[in-house]
């Protein structure tokens, strides 16, 4: 037999204990699918989130980071410290790559320059705390 | 910011039809279902329709079952309201609203009347 | 049908007066209940969803309260500007319905 919530369209919810009733989803909250027992609170952008979708009765906030920081995880759980290229991000804030290393992000860690030789080549350009060495021909 | 704008309202003579339209803007019309609401003059609000984001699911109220057709156009951002076999007792201002009845329209008056 | 019934049909108040207002349903209909005001010549604007939530813009000195079948809205210290007709509505089941309304005038 067919579930009788499965006609309550998205935006509603279906409640199994009136007759399988579809209900519209109070102000803020939605349900992104049809048939569903409730409707979810929307996100709400707050603090160092900005929302860069409204949420509907059918599809939720989504978030974006303010300016000086950028979005981790799914669905931008999580907004970090922008650094500048050069540098990268730690526990007492931005620090600049050590040497042999470079971000050219103002996000991610600082990584090791290329080693040419292990490709049997020679450093063209020299690398900078903000871009990796450049490898020419071979020696 | 979110608008909700009707049209459409008038004079009409008993037994006939009239469109209602509701123009909106300031949100993404097509993630939320409409309803229409009336308020006969002097009176309460009245539920009259209701159509699903995607117009999979429409409801009316039993007052205007097989007399009144509430639809929409999400690419123009729009609901309509059609009424046939209009009586005195629709006589009233017409609202539209989202679903989550947060935003009303200022409403457009219809009075059927010979 | 759900009925939402509500009392008093008006009343007369000082402005910085305490105002308390009901609505009852026919039947239970959990918390889906919202309050809407609306001035003369005016559409009507939500002030409480969910029986208790203020919705966005909306002065604390709304406060909406109750479940199930009896809901309350009050007005902490009714202004001038909060003279209008009230009204409460359920959005439990269709048939959505709404109560007659509580006209709210200065005395």
């Known amino acids: 037999l067919q579930d009788p919530c499965s006609n309550c369209p998205a935006g509603t919810f279906c409640d199994n204990n009136r007759n399988q009733i579809c209900s519209p989803c109070p102000p803020n909250s939605f349900s992104s699918a049809g048939g569903q027992r409730t409707c979810d609170i929307c996100r709400q952008c707050k603090g160092v989130f900005r929302t860069r979708k409204e949420c509907s009765s059918t599809s939720n906030a989504e978030c974006d980071c303010t300016p000086g920081f950028h979005c981790l995880g799914a669905g931008c759980s999580m907004c970090e410290q922008d650094c500048k290229q050069g540098q990268e991000l730690t526990k007492k804030g931005c620090k600049d790559c050590c040497f042999g290393t470079f971000n050219d992000q103002k996000r991610g860690i600082c990584r090791p320059w290329t080693n040419c030789s292990l490709d049997g080549k020679s450093v063209l350009v020299n690398g900078t705390k903000e871009r990796d060495v450049v490898c020419g021909p071979s020696p | 910011q979110v608008q909700l704008q009707e049209s459409g309202g008038g004079l009409v003579k008993p037994g006939g039809s009239r469109k209602l339209s509701c123009a909106a803007s300031g949100f993404t019309f097509s993630e939320f279902g409409m309803h229409w609401v009336r308020q006969a003059p002097d009176k309460g609000l009245e539920w009259v329709a209701y159509i699903s984001s995607g117009s999979s699911t429409i409801y009316y109220a039993d007052t205007v079952k097989g007399r009144f057709t509430i639809s929409r156009d999400n690419a123009k951002n729009t609901l309509f309201l059609q009424m046939t076999s209009l009586r005195s007792e629709d006589t009233a201002m017409y609202y539209c609203?989202?679903?989550?009845?947060?935003?009303w329209g200022q409403g457009t008056a219809l009075t059927v009347s010979s | 049908n759900i009925v939402m019934t509500q009392s008093p049909k008006s009343m007369s108040m000082s402005v910085g007066e305490r105002v308390t207002l009901s609505c009852k349903a026919s039947?239970?209909?959990?918390?889906?209940v919202s309050w809407y005001q609306q001035k003369p010549e005016k559409s009507p604007k939500l002030l409480i969803y969910?029986?208790?939530n203020r919705y966005t813009g909306v002065p604390d000195r709304f406060t909406g309260s109750g479940s199930a079948t009896d809901f309350t809205l009050t007005i902490s210290s009714v202004q001038a500007e909060d003279l209008a007709d009230y009204h409460c509505g359920q959005s439990y089941s269709y048939p959505l319905t709404f109560g007659a309304g509580t006209k709210l005038e200065l005395k």
């Open positions: 969910g029986a208790s």
């Open positions: 039947e239970n209909v959990g918390s889906y």
């Open positions: 609203a989202r679903d989550w009845v947060d935003y």
